[in-house]
């Protein structure tokens, strides 16, 4: 190989070892029988060399740096050439570096021809291996503007006081043009301006200078977005950190053409604007940092450009002004990420502040709209707390657990509506009475309705899940000792049509000691399946639950247990079951940790089933499943 660099070309070529490899044999640059691992060639030098191996690209890289001085003479503006031509260089991974030094008052603009650039974050790489690393200068300090691949939206980068552009080409890449030109501009009075052009729908992820390290103190950086007028843009911050400011405040400013409030100033922690039509600018402004503990300012954000959806012009009013202790969250439902571009799905407050999730709180009227191609990608979760603090005032008071119609009218599927029901400890208990009798969901008889009620304890230390219940069964009411959460969970869009079947009333009643009491009034010809709470994890220690099972006078009930033994092993105490006839008070007591479970038994009158747990050893829990079936009496035994 021979490399000859013209005098006054201000080009230096450096061949050096690349990333360490586990290759068995080293490779050297050979110059007049001397074996070396680094070769530097300066302007005006001509050097002939060879490599001591067949595949030098596995060992060496080549850097070609051209210094362009715009301080002492005219600047060579226009299209930048690759010099020396790639055909004259050994086939090594190559990095062309252009280091342009200019006065502070001179603006320099890098213009990228098609394909435009796409910024990548730390740890990311470009599919074709071609990367553009761009840095600027503040006095003597180098500032990294970013690393970019091809096929993006970045068309121009403006800087002042100098720019360093490094183009990395893999040894096998045929590219023989730089793909950019340099133009001079008036001073931009900031660190840099990055222009990002969208031709159609798409997204761009961009980062503050020096990311993931800190943005330079008290600097200003601007991104200009060129967006076709018929499309909408939304900004979301993916990652940010704030530094410790001594003077001024870190902020982002939006300049939105046509807005009467330009510039619109936002804190980094605010929800950022969405649903913007046409071009806009975003600027990041740093502050004067605390010298002792500066912290770091950094920002990574995404701009999503897409067609406005039909829904985006429709305003929905969610009136929560008469509600108390309630919050409504609209958020993306969990989905597997696909690799192709997926338009964003945003919910907007007052049509401007758009984000992928939004929480509305009680006490206000909210106006929302959607910027989303497919509203099935979103769902709603609502939480409402009904609490009683004064037992004298609450006793016998009732509340309807009903999803408000305002919420049902939204074009987004309701996922969960949770009521947290709180009572004063040891003073009051709760009773749930459904509009339609409930069925307990079991493997043997699963619910197939569009919604269910999930009933669980709301006491933080207590792990007690009573079960999942849906309309169309035999459970007339559920009484619970203390705080619970009742969650209406929907399973199908048809819930909108079946919403009339929902309806649950909660009343505060005098305190009782049992954890729960289920009142069951079986219908004839249907088998009722019932199971102990906490089915998968076992009834909690020392917990007692009862079922009050009604038997009509012309019927007989068959009580069947689905195991021979309960399987519970007690560490302390005893686990027992009492089956008690309500009319005669006659009762049978079974030791669940010793006895076999009773064979199917027939009951001609209403009866109780009470199950009380011991403190079981781990892994030997108490789980019971039983059924009640009514059949007509053939002989009157009374």
């Amino acid at each position: 190989f021979e490399i000859a660099l013209p005098r006054e070309s201000n080009i230096t070529v450096l061949i050096k070892l690349g990333t360490p490899t586990l290759l068995a044999k080293p490779c050297y640059i050979v110059i007049s029988k001397r074996h070396i691992t680094m070769l530097s060639i300066k302007s005006g030098e001509r050097i002939v060399f060879t490599f001591s191996c067949q595949s030098p690209e596995n060992h060496f890289v080549i850097e070609i740096q051209k210094n362009i001085d715009c301080m002492s003479g005219p600047c060579p503006f226009g299209e930048v050439q690759l010099q020396p031509s790639t055909s004259l260089l050994p086939t090594l991974n190559r990095t062309f570096i252009w280091d342009v030094k200019a006065h502070k008052s001179i603006g320099l603009e890098l213009q990228f021809s098609i394909p435009r650039l796409r910024q990548i974050g730390p740890g990311e790489s470009c599919p074709d291996g071609v990367t553009h690393s761009i840095s600027g200068r503040i006095d003597a300090t180098v500032v990294r503007i970013g690393t970019f691949c091809s096929n993006g939206t970045v068309s121009r980068i403006k800087m002042q006081e100098g720019v360093k552009m490094a183009l990395h080409l893999p040894w096998f890449h045929p590219r023989n043009v730089s793909g950019f030109s340099i133009a001079n501009r008036s001073s931009i009075k900031r660190l840099c301006i990055i222009e990002s052009v969208f031709e159609g729908e798409g997204s761009a992820t961009l980062m503050s200078a020096n990311y993931p390290e800190g943005f330079p103190e008290d600097e200003l950086m601007t991104w200009q977005f060129v967006v076709p007028a018929h499309l909408r843009a939304s900004v979301s911050f993916l990652n940010f950190n704030l530094s410790n400011c001594e003077r001024k405040e870190e902020r982002v400013e939006y300049y939105i053409p046509g807005s009467t409030t330009n510039p619109e100033v936002f804190k980094l922690e605010d929800k950022q604007p969405g649903n913007m039509a046409g071009n806009f600018n975003l600027s990041l402004q740093g502050c004067d940092q605390d010298a002792q503990s500066p912290g770091i300012l950094r920002l990574q954000f995404q701009v999503l450009v897409q067609h406005p959806q039909n829904e985006s012009n429709k305003i929905y009013v969610v009136d929560l002004s008469n509600e108390r202790a309630m919050s409504l969250t609209i958020e993306p439902r969990p989905v597997k990420q696909s690799r192709k571009f997926v338009p964003g799905c945003f919910v907007c407050l007052e049509s401007r502040t758009c984000s992928s999730n939004l929480t509305l709180t009680s006490g206000s009227k909210h106006k929302i709209s959607f910027l989303c191609d497919d509203l099935t990608r979103l769902w709603m979760n609502v939480e409402k707390t009904i609490s009683c603090t004064d037992h004298r005032y609450c006793q016998r008071k009732s509340y309807s657990l009903q999803v408000p119609s305002d919420i049902l009218h939204l074009p987004v599927e309701l996922h969960d509506f949770s009521w947290k029901l709180l009572v004063p400890k040891d003073r009051l208990s709760l009773v749930l009475v459904p509009a339609q009798k409930l069925q307990q969901h079991t493997h043997e008889k699963p619910c197939n309705t569009s919604f269910s009620y999930l009933v669980a304890s709301a006491i933080p230390s207590q792990d007690l899940y009573f079960g999942s219940f849906c309309p169309g069964g035999s459970i007339k009411q559920i009484q619970v000792k203390q705080n619970i959460s009742v969650t209406l969970r929907t399973f199908a869009p048809s819930f909108q049509q079946e919403a009339s079947r929902q309806g649950l009333t909660v009343s505060f009643i005098p305190y009782f000691k049992e954890e729960g009491v289920f009142t069951v009034t079986p219908d004839t010809k249907s088998k009722v399946y019932l199971r102990t709470p906490n089915w998968d994890r076992g009834l909690p220690s020392l917990t007692s639950v009862s079922w009050n099972i009604s038997v009509p006078r012309d019927q007989v009930a068959c009580l069947t247990f689905f195991k021979e033994r309960s399987g519970v092993v007690c560490q302390t105490g005893r686990a027992f079951m009492i089956i008690q006839e309500q009319r005669t008070r006659a009762e049978e007591i079974f030791s669940l940790d010793e006895d076999v479970l009773p064979k199917p038994s027939f009951h001609h009158h209403s009866f109780w089933v009470n199950i009380s747990n011991c403190s079981p050893t781990s892994g030997k829990q108490l789980d019971l499943l039983f059924s009640v079936t009514l059949t007509p009496r053939t002989v009157d035994l009374t």
Epitope: L17, P20, K25, P26, I36, T37, S40
Partner: antibody, heavy 116, light 108 residues
Framework: EVQLVESGGGLVQPGGSLRLSCAAS????????IHWVRQAPGKGLEWVAS????????SYADSVKGRFTISADTSKNTAYLQMNSLRAEDTAVYYC?????????WGQGTLVTVSS | DIQMTQSPSSLSASVGDRVTITCRAS??????VAWYQQKPGKAPKLLIY???SLYSGVPSRFSGSRSGTDFTLTISSLQPEDFATYYC??????????FGQGTKVEIK
């Protein structure tokens, strides 16, 4: 696994001689530059000599030129440093190092003490 | 011979600090500079080669840079295991190899 093990250090009188060995394993010594670097007690690092046995290339620091000789036996995958006319200022821990990405592998060192 | 003037000769720092050590070459050595870490009683370990290339297995908090004949080793966030002595070294072409005098990084 690449390893370098020095041996041959010890106490020697001024004017005396000593031969240090550097046994290499895990790589072929003839493909690489081997260097000797020394460190006097409490002082910094000082390069002494180097050899690239494939082309019989050797090089020495001015302070040892004419007194020290670097060599290698590729069949034994071992490099040597023959030290003659030793002086008190040659007292140091002597390291051998393999060079490619800089001095990427070093031996544990052997102590040479020149004293009467 | 090419002199490598290393500064400071010692410094005190705390865990988490950003530490910078510089070496100035008495004449151009291109990028033929390496940085080493040495702990008492142990052989030196290679950190950086070719002025700015991180050697394999070395934590990414270590970085090297070059500006003309000035070379810098930076530890972005000092860890307890980083307290040691650091040396720069030039190995430019036909010149004898030379080391800097060393910088001892101590706990503040």
């Amino acid at each position: 696994e690449v390893q370098l093990v020095e041996s041959g250090g010890g106490l020697v009188q001024p004017g005396g001689s000593l031969r240090l060995s550097c046994a290499a394993s895990g790589f072929n010594l003839s493909y690489y530059y081997i260097h000797w670097v020394r460190q006097a007690p409490g002082k910094g690092l000082e390069w002494v000599a180097s050899i690239y046995s494939s082309s019989s290339y050797t090089s020495y620091a001015d302070s040892v030129k004419g007194r020290f000789t670097i060599s290698a036996d590729t069949s034994k995958n071992t490099a040597y440093l023959q030290m003659n006319s030793l002086r008190a200022e040659d007292t140091a821990v002597y390291y051998c190092a393999r060079a490619y990405y800089g001095f990427d592998y070093w031996g544990q060192g052997t102590l040479v003490t020149v004293s009467s | 011979d090419i002199q490598m003037t290393q500064s400071p000769s010692s410094l005190s720092a705390s865990v988490g600090d950003r530490v910078t050590i510089t070496c100035r070459a008495s004449q151009s050595v291109s990028s033929a500079v390496a940085w080493y870490q040495q702990k008492p009683g142990k052989a030196p370990k290679l950190l950086i080669y070719s002025a700015s290339s991180l050697y394999s297995g070395v934590p990414s908090r270590f970085s090297g840079s070059r500006s003309g004949t000035d070379f810098t080793l930076t530890i972005s966030s000092l860890q307890p295991e980083d307290f040691a002595t650091y040396y720069c070294q030039q190995s430019y072409y036909y010149y004898p190899i030379t080391f800097g005098q060393g910088t001892k990084v101590e706990i503040k």
